[in-house]
Interface confidence: low
């Protein structure tokens, strides 16, 4: 079937359109194009005779049409009036006619639109704004964009006038956005430049910063006010209702108590005509003086004196605080606070009470600290110590003894030999000593402030012959696998070699044996029962040698798992049952028995005469070593058969 296709169907003014013919019949004489939906000679555009290839213009020919041999018609430089139907009349060789009609529509190219507004500065929550997309164009569709997004759904947004007008009712500050309109028709689409809606709003209730309302006398008061507003608000400050200045900031240096009061910030928007105020109440507190500590005793004596520390000055209705060593006061019966906390009393001071001590005065804003105070506690002297600890010396060496006693103020020292004063020094030095220098050496420490004295006496023996040594032990009854024992060979002597023997043999190599202190001390780690041996120490120098008496180590151990004898478990009725329990233990353990869980006697031997089958059951022996604190047990099952039924035993 003969058909006409318009390419394109929608044509922009000034462009061209091709009326394309499909299914053109064979054996044609010619064809004609007409404007309209029917063949009308008055509206012929062009005719074409195939034989002569001659095209003849008709009354409706405009000079913009071109006919092709395949009957298609090209119309150039399209105008609005070209819109409509076009009919092709085909004349076949047999003079039978055929017709087909096509159509196209002509649209104008749209100009770039623009937005007009009925209100360039609308007021929030009051005004409406109508945007209109210009120009008005026939057969155009109007679209709107907000911030490059399609219009949101909102009861405050209304489209009218064929979508050409966008109305925003009761504008808010959030409507401050970029608005664009777009026009569309089938041949073009154009978007306007953006229009920014400038919504006048505010001022909102102003905020005053900073938020703090308490200040100290002497500080600077610097208040800032801000209110959301378009255009930006103009600010005024009032203090206690009196106008101060028209600035956003209020600055008052070096404030006093007189600056306390109500501070009002007023924000004004000249375009909306609105005013909003916010009030803050500022309180200025007087600056208290820096506290300081007084003491009733600047040099207290340890364990004798009390000290009262007082926080100055005295201020009514003030909270006093105390710190010792930068920490709050510890709970102690020796520390007492007065009712107002202003006085801290230390009862019976010790050398550890030196401090430092601080007191504080608390006010509304902060705590003011005093400078720290340190107590000068007089103490000592403690018992002096004489070093070195040697008591035996060989003739010809130098004797150098030093004395020290903890004391404040530092002790004064005196040396006495056999009760005779020698010198007032901390060190005692005697060169090239002889046996005559043997004796009692006394160090006396004296504290001049407290008047106290303490003495220590040391026996010094000067002899070419070494004394017979002895062994001291730090643990006379060590527990196996738990304790260590340290044996020390006494006395400590200069230029002396220390030796050890165990059961008459030199020390075995063992990781549990360790010599220290110049071989003078022998330590046994994790003692075992096998360490219960005879230990001897010896001392020797170039002149003599000597051995101690043996010391036997008493190792506490056990109880081990007990053994019940005899081993038999089957007996004949009428026999005597005689069970003996034994467990390795030092000291010997306590024994007890249970039969079928029922406690029996506390003996090592359990004897039951003339047993019967009623004596069947479990026989348990319990052992306990009170020294090691350890327990152990074993259970044995006994079966008693009636006479003759089993080859049992008689006891």
């Amino acid at each position: 079937k003969l058909t006409i296709e318009s390419t394109p169907f929608n044509v922009a003014e000034g462009k061209e359109v091709l009326l394309l013919v499909h299914n053109l019949p064979q054996h044609l004489f010619g064809y004609s194009w007409y404007k309209g939906e029917r063949v009308d000679g008055n509206r012929q555009i062009i005719g074409y005779v195939i034989g002569t290839q001659q095209a003849t213009p008709g009354p409706a020919y405009s000079g913009r049409e071109i006919i092709y041999p395949n009957a298609s018609l090209l119309i150039q430089n399209i105008i609005q009036n070209d819109t409509g139907f076009y009919t092709l009349h085909v004349i076949k060789s047999d003079l039978v006619n055929e017709e087909a009609t096509g159509q196209f529509r002509v649209y104008p190219e749209l100009p770039k639109p623009s937005i007009s507004s009925n209100n360039s500065k609308p007021v929030e929550d009051k005004d409406a704004v109508a945007f209109t997309c210009e120009p008005e164009t026939q057969d155009a569709t109007y679209l709107w964009w907000v911030n490059n997004q399609s219009l949101p759904v909102s009861p405050r947004l209304q489209l009218s006038n064929g979508n050409r007008t966008l109305t925003l009712f009761n504008v808010t500050r959030n409507d401050t956005a970029s608005y664009k309109c777009e026009t569309q028709n089938p041949v073009s689409a154009r978007r306007s430049d953006s229009v920014i809606l400038n919504v006048l709003y505010g001022p909102d209730a102003p905020t005053i910063s900073p938020l703090n309302t308490s200040y100290r006398s002497g500080e600077n008061l610097n208040l800032s006010c801000h209110a959301a507003s378009n255009p930006p608000a103009q600010y005024s400050w009032f203090v206690n209702g009196t106008f101060q200045q028209s600035t956003q900031e209020l600055f008052i240096p070096n404030i006093t108590v007189n600056n306390s009061g109500s501070y009002t910030c007023q924000a004004h928007n000249s375009d909306t005509g609105l005013n909003r105020t916010t009030v803050t109440t500022i309180t200025v507190y007087a600056e208290p003086p820096k506290p300081f500590i007084t003491s009733n005793n600047s040099n207290p004596v340890e364990d004798e004196d009390a000290v009262a520390l007082t926080c100055e000055p005295e201020i009514q209705n003030t909270t006093y605080l105390w710190w010792v060593n930068n920490q709050s006061l510890p709970v102690s019966p020796r520390l007492q606070l007065s009712n107002d906390n202003r006085t801290l009393t230390l009862l019976s001071v010790t050398r550890n009470d030196v401090g430092p001590y601080e007191c504080g005065i608390q006010n509304e804003l902060s705590v003011d600290h005093s400078d720290p105070v340190i107590l000068n506690v007089l103490y000592g002297p403690d018992d002096p110590t004489i070093s070195p600890s040697y008591t035996y010396y060989r003739p010809g060496v130098n004797l150098s003894l030093s004395c020290h006693a903890a004391s404040n103020p530092p002790a004064q020292y005196s040396w006495l030999i056999d009760g005779n004063i020698q010198q007032h020094t901390q060190e005692l030095f005697i060169s090239n000593i002889t046996e005559k220098n043997s004796g009692l050496y006394t160090c006396q420490a004296n504290n001049s402030a407290s008047g106290h004295s303490r003495t220590t006496v040391k026996t010094i023996t000067v002899s070419a012959e070494l004394p017979k040594p002895s062994i001291s032990s730090n643990n006379s009854k060590p527990v196996e696998d738990k304790d260590a024992v340290a044996f020390t060979c006494e006395p400590e002597a200069q230029n002396t070699t220390y030796l050890w023997w165990v059961n008459g043999q030199s020390l075995p190599v063992s990781p549990r044996l360790q010599l220290s202190n110049g071989n003078r001390t022998l330590t046994l780690f994790n003692v075992t029962r096998n360490d219960a041996r005879a230990y001897v120490c010896g001392i020797q120098n170039s002149v003599s040698a000597n051995r101690s008496d043996p010391v036997t180590l008493d190792v506490l151990y056990g109880p081990d798992t007990p053994i019940i004898s005899p081993p038999d478990s089957s007996y004949l009725s009428g026999a005597n049952l005689n069970l003996s329990c034994h467990s390795a233990s030092n000291p010997s353990p306590q024994y007890s028995w249970r039969i079928n869980g029922i406690p029996q006697q506390h003996t090592q031997v359990l004897f039951i005469a003339k047993i019967t089958p009623n004596n069947n059951g479990t026989y348990a022996c319990f052992v306990s070593n009170l020294a090691t604190g350890r327990n152990n047990s074993i259970v044995k099952s006994i079966t008693v058969s009636a006479s003759g039924t089993s080859p049992g035993l008689s006891a």
């Epitope: 610097n222 801000h226 930006p232 956003q248």
Partner: antibody
Framework: EVQLVQSGAEVKKPGASVKVSCKAS????????MNWVRQAPGQGLEWIGD????????DYNRKFKDRATLTVDKSTSTVYMEFSSLRSEDTAVYYC????????????WGQGTLVTVSS | DVQMTQSPSSLSASVGDRVTITCRTS??????LNWYQQKPGGAVKLLIY???GLLSGVPSRFSGSGSGTDYTLTISSLQPEDFATYYC?????????FGGGTKVEIK
């Protein structure tokens, strides 16, 4: 006396990041905004952004929003500016400045930190 | 962003001269216009805030005026310590922006 003390000069390669610190003293640190401003050699001043130490809220110049990060350590009264993806045109003196009067009045400034970006 | 145009970019003057520096903004900034001084060492110091507010400690020979989009910094009698670069800055609209600076040199 209000003082803003900045960290020392830095030399960085293009593409790297730099972190500059600004330690404040002599005032209530959390009550005032801290701003960062830069000045390229022989050029004027350019605002980067600000931070409110009390809550860590920040505002940035759109130009630097993707590359500048402002943080605060209230315990040390220190504000930090980290600047990433450095380019040679980021070579500048970077200042911290306190806003003491609202509406971006910079009443105290740090001594400045020179950041040099060079391959 | 609000554009800040400062003029002149530099000027030569003598001690005792009256010096005027102007700053023009691309839009009305209310009164939120501040002036700063930068000495050659790099230290920046606030002089005037909110168009005419003289910061505590700043000599009274410095003054500020203006409204809308046109603002002026005046030094009534130039002193040796005043030779520096001066910047205007607006705080009305984010981001705050600075003028290009005016360098005041000794004639």
């Amino acid at each position: 006396e209000v003082q803003l003390v900045q960290s020392g000069a830095e030399v960085k390669k293009p593409g790297a990041s730099v972190k500059v610190s600004c330690k404040a003293s002599g005032y209530t640190f959390t009550d005032f905004y801290m701003n960062w401003v830069r000045q390229a050699p022989g050029q004027g001043l350019e605002w980067i952004g600000d931070i409110f130490p009390k809550n860590g809220n920040t505002d940035y110049n759109r130009k630097f929003k993707d590359r500048a990060t402002l943080t605060v350590d209230k315990s040390t009264s220190t504000v930090y500016m980290e600047f990433s993806s450095l380019r040679s045109e980021d070579t500048a003196v970077y200042y911290c400045a306190r806003s003491g009067y609202g509406n971006y009045v910079f009443d105290y400034w740090g001594q400045g930190t020179l950041v040099t970006v060079s391959s | 962003d609000v554009q800040m145009t400062q003029s002149p970019s530099s000027l030569s003057a003598s001690v005792g001269d009256r010096v005027t520096i102007t700053c023009r903004t691309s839009q009305d900034i209310n009164i939120y216009l501040n002036w700063y001084q930068q000495k050659p060492g790099g230290a920046v110091k606030l002089l005037i805030y909110y168009r005419s507010g003289l910061l505590s400690g700043v000599p009274s020979r410095f003054s500020g005026s203006g409204s809308g989009t046109d603002y002026t910094l005046t030094i009534s009698s130039l002193q040796p310590e005043d030779f520096a670069t001066y910047y205007c800055q607006q705080g009305n609209t984010l981001p705050p922006t600075f003028g290009g600076g005016t360098k005041v040199e000794i004639k």
